[in-house]
């Protein structure tokens, strides 16, 4: 039992410490500007980021990653015609 | 035949509302990202926005806040609704299958 | 965000001539995810050219693109009476989506 219950804080631990380094990529990105002014669904707005929302900072920088993946992909399949790249997840909604 | 066919346009007063459809026929649209484009009378194209398969849309950021895209995947139609229309937003809006194939548009005037 | 400029606006041109319009970018083009469009008045849009010089499947041979990063052409070497229409460039833009060209009209001399 002693040795699950290690397996059990382990894998807590490394999921902590997965979040943690996801963190820093997504400051990193907030550093690099990364995002733009492209909409997302409504109640998306994108705010200015400023020291004093640090606590959104993650949520905010992560939102407009995904909305950059999401358009690269649309380029790709529809002004590229890279058919391979188009979302498929029908089963979705 | 495969084809779009927009509908829902017409007259309607600034600051009104209005949904459009986009009908699909004889093609499965489900797995498709759909897009919205308009074309204000005598002018170029302008983009609005796009729905992925997965129902998630992005639009333009002139859009965003007053443009909303949705879709049905089990009515095989994708709509737009505007809100808080102005006189600008007189045109001709298109709905594309990606952007090879398109509607034959539907008008929407914006007037008093 | 990026603004497609295409030249010339207007071009007067005869059956069988060689005929290039420009579209000029601000920036880059992402991917160089480039088309080109062909509309008839009271029409949809028709997709002719994808990825700069890709002719899309049915358009004739005639059609060409060219370029790459900020300068692309559409060229039809050899102009026939169905040509005569409005050509629009759309390039991807990863902060605005799509962004189109003020158009060419193409008109018979």
């Known amino acids: 039992r002693r040795d699950v219950a290690h397996g059990i804080l382990n894998e807590a631990y490394r999921k902590v410490l997965d979040q943690l380094s996801a963190g820093k990529h997504l400051q990193s990105l907030v550093a690099r500007g990364v995002g733009g002014s492209l909409g997302g669904g409504a109640g998306d707005d994108a705010e200015p980021l400023s020291k004093r929302h640090s606590d959104g900072i993650f949520t905010d920088s992560y939102s407009r990653y995904r909305k950059q993946m999401a358009v690269k992909k649309y380029l790709a399949a529809v002004l590229g015609k890279r058919y391979k790249q188009r979302v498929k997840n029908k089963g979705r909604r | 035949e495969v084809q779009l066919v927009e509908s829902g346009g017409g007259l309607v007063q600034p600051g009104g509302s209005l949904r459009l459809s986009c009908a699909a026929s004889g093609i499965d649209l489900n797995s498709y990202y759909m897009t919205w484009v308009r074309q204000a009378p005598g002018k170029g194209l302008e983009w609005i926005g796009f729905?992925?398969?997965?129902?998630?849309?992005y639009y333009a950021s002139w859009a965003k806040g007053r443009f909303t895209i949705s879709r049905d995947n089990s009515k095989n139609t994708v709509y737009l609704q505007m809100n808080s229309l102005r006189a600008e937003d007189t045109a001709v809006y298109f709905c594309?299958?990606?952007?090879?194939?398109w509607g034959q548009g539907t008008l929407v005037t914006v007037s008093s | 965000d990026i603004q497609l400029t295409q030249s010339p606006s207007t071009l007067s041109a005869s059956v069988g001539d060689r005929v290039t319009i420009t579209c000029q970018s601000s920036e880059s083009v992402y991917g160089n995810y480039l088309a080109w469009f062909q509309q008839k008045p009271g029409k949809a849009p028709k997709f002719l050219i994808y990825?700069?010089?890709k002719l899309e499947s049915g358009v004739p041979s005639r059609f060409s693109g060219s370029g790459s990063g900020t300068e692309f052409t559409l060229t039809i070497s050899s102009l026939q009476p169905d040509d005569f229409a409005t050509y629009y460039c759309?390039?991807?833009?990863?902060?605005?989506?799509?962004?189109f060209g003020g158009g060419t009209k193409v008109e018979i001399k």
């Open positions: 729905i992925d398969a997965g129902g998630d849309a």
């Open positions: 759309a390039g991807g833009d990863i902060s605005e989506g799509v962004a």
């Open positions: 594309a299958r990606d952007l090879d194939l």
């Open positions: 990825e700069a010089s």
